[in-house]
C-alpha cells in the first residue's frame, strides 16, 4: 500500500507536471504566437483510456512530437528551451509511471490538435491529484 510520504511525492510530481503542461498551453495560446496556425496542423494521439499513472506511457510517447511543436514557437513564450522543458517532463513522467512496467498504450481513433492534447493531459493530472488529496 502507498505510504503517505509516497502519496505526497506523487502529488507533488503531478502538480509539477500539471504546471509544466499549463505553461506550455499558455505559451502556445499566446495571441502573439505567429506559429499557432502551423502548430495546430500537427497531429497528436490521445489515449483510449487515461485513469491511472501507468497511462502516462501514452503521454511519454507523444513528448517527441511535442518537443518538435515547441521548437516552432518563439522561445520567449517559455521559460526554458523546448529540449530542457521536455527533458524535465520526461523525468517526471518516468518517475510517475515507473520505468520497469512496459505498458502498451492504446490510442483513440481520432487525432487531436496540440491544444486538445494538452487539455486532455491537464485534465488527467487534475483528476489524479483530486483522488490523492
Amino acid at each position: 500500500a502507498p505510504t503517505s510520504s509516497s502519496t505526497k511525492k506523487t502529488q507533488l510530481q503531478l502538480e509539477h507536471l500539471l504546471l509544466d503542461l499549463q505553461m506550455i498551453l499558455n505559451g502556445i495560446n499566446n495571441y502573439k504566437n505567429p506559429k499557432l496556425t502551423r502548430m495546430l496542423t500537427f497531429k497528436f494521439y490521445m489515449p483510449k483510456k487515461a485513469t491511472e499513472l501507468k497511462h502516462l506511457q501514452c503521454l511519454e510517447e507523444e513528448l517527441g512530437p511535442l518537443e518538435e511543436v515547441l521548437n516552432l514557437a518563439q522561445s520567449k513564450n517559455f521559460h526554458l528551451r523546448p529540449r530542457d522543458l521536455i527533458s524535465n517532463i520526461r523525468v517526471i513522467v518516468l518517475e510517475l509511471k515507473g520505468s520497469e512496467t512496459t505498458f502498451m498504450c492504446e490510442y483513440a481513433d481520432e487525432t487531436a490538435t496540440i491544444v486538445e492534447f494538452l487539455n486532455r493531459w491537464i485534465t488527467f493530472c487534475q483528476s489524479i491529484i483530486s483522488t490523492l488529496t
Epitope: 502551423r38 511519454e60 518538435e68 521548437n71 516552432l72 490510442y107
Partner: antibody, heavy 123, light 107 residues
C-alpha cells in the same frame, strides 16, 4: 505515394565541397522534416542532421557541425546537403529521409528514403 | 549521445527458422526505437516503429518487443528474402543514433 529522388554520384578531391539534392514528389516538402543519413562502405548508418523546410530551422550532429549545411527550396520541393572540407573518411552513400507529424504515427519515423548518393573522396 | 548495441553482429540461420535480434540502449529511451532492414545497394526500409508497431506493408512474421532498455526484433519463420542487415534507431533525443547492425545470413 511520396518519393524522394536524389542527385547522382559525385567524385571529389580532399578539401573540396559537395552538394547533394533530394527532390520530394507526391506531397509538399513543407509537410516533412528532411533528414540526412550517411553510410560509409561496409559500415553502419550515421545521422547527419535535419531541416524544417517551413522555417529553415536546422539541427546537426556534433560531428558535422561547421562542415555541413542543410537547406531547402520550397519552390522546387527540394532539400540539399552540403559538406565541405571533404576527407577520405567522408566517402559514403548519403541518404535523405523524412519525418512528419501531420499524418500517421508511422510517418514520425524514417518511413521514406531516397535511393542514396555515392560520394567518393579521392586524390 | 545514446549508444545502441546490437547483437549478435552476425546471425547464421536457415529459412523457416526463428530469428531473434537484440538492441540494447545505453540509457532509457522509452519506446522511441525503430527497426530497419537493408539489402545490398538499397536504402533502409522501416519494419517496426515505436518499439512494437508493425510498419505498413511489412509481413506479420516480423515483430518487436521491449523490456526496459532491451529491444528485440523477432522474425518468426525466416523467408529467403529476409536475409539482410538489420539496424535499430533511437528517436528519443538528438543526435539520433543507430545500432551497428546485425547481418542475418543463410546458414
Amino acid at each position: 505515394q511520396v518519393q524522394l529522388v536524389q542527385s547522382g554520384a559525385e567524385v571529389k578531391k580532399p578539401g573540396a565541397t559537395v552538394k547533394i539534392s533530394c527532390k520530394v514528389s507526391g506531397d509538399t516538402i513543407t509537410a516533412y522534416y528532411m533528414h540526412w543519413v550517411r553510410q560509409a562502405p561496409g559500415q553502419g548508418l550515421e545521422w547527419i542532421g535535419r531541416i524544417d523546410p517551413d522555417d529553415d530551422s536546422t539541427k546537426y550532429a556534433e560531428n558535422f557541425k561547421g562542415r555541413v549545411t542543410i537547406t531547402a527550396d520550397t519552390s522546387t520541393d527540394t532539400a540539399y546537403m552540403e559538406l565541405s572540407s571533404l576527407r577520405s573518411e567522408d566517402t559514403a552513400v548519403y541518404y535523405c529521409t523524412t519525418i512528419t507529424f501531420l499524418y500517421s504515427r508511422e510517418l514520425r519515423w524514417f518511413a521514406y528514403w531516397g535511393q542514396g548518393t555515392l560520394v567518393t573522396v579521392s586524390s | 549521445d545514446i549508444v545502441l548495441t546490437q547483437s549478435p553482429a552476425t546471425l547464421s540461420l536457415s529459412p523457416g527458422e526463428r530469428a531473434t535480434l537484440s538492441c540494447q540502449a545505453s540509457q532509457y529511451i522509452g519506446n522511441y526505437l525503430s527497426w530497419y532492414q537493408q539489402k545490398p545497394g538499397q536504402a533502409p526500409r522501416l519494419l517496426i516503429y515505436q518499439a512494437t508497431s508493425l510498419a505498413s506493408g511489412i509481413p506479420a512474421r516480423f515483430s518487436g518487443s521491449r523490456s526496459g532498455t532491451d529491444f528485440t526484433l523477432t522474425i518468426s519463420s525466416l523467408e529467403p528474402e529476409d536475409f539482410a542487415v538489420y539496424y535499430c534507431l533511437q528517436h528519443y533525443s538528438t543526435p539520433y543514433t543507430f545500432g551497428q547492425g546485425t547481418k542475418l545470413e543463410i546458414k
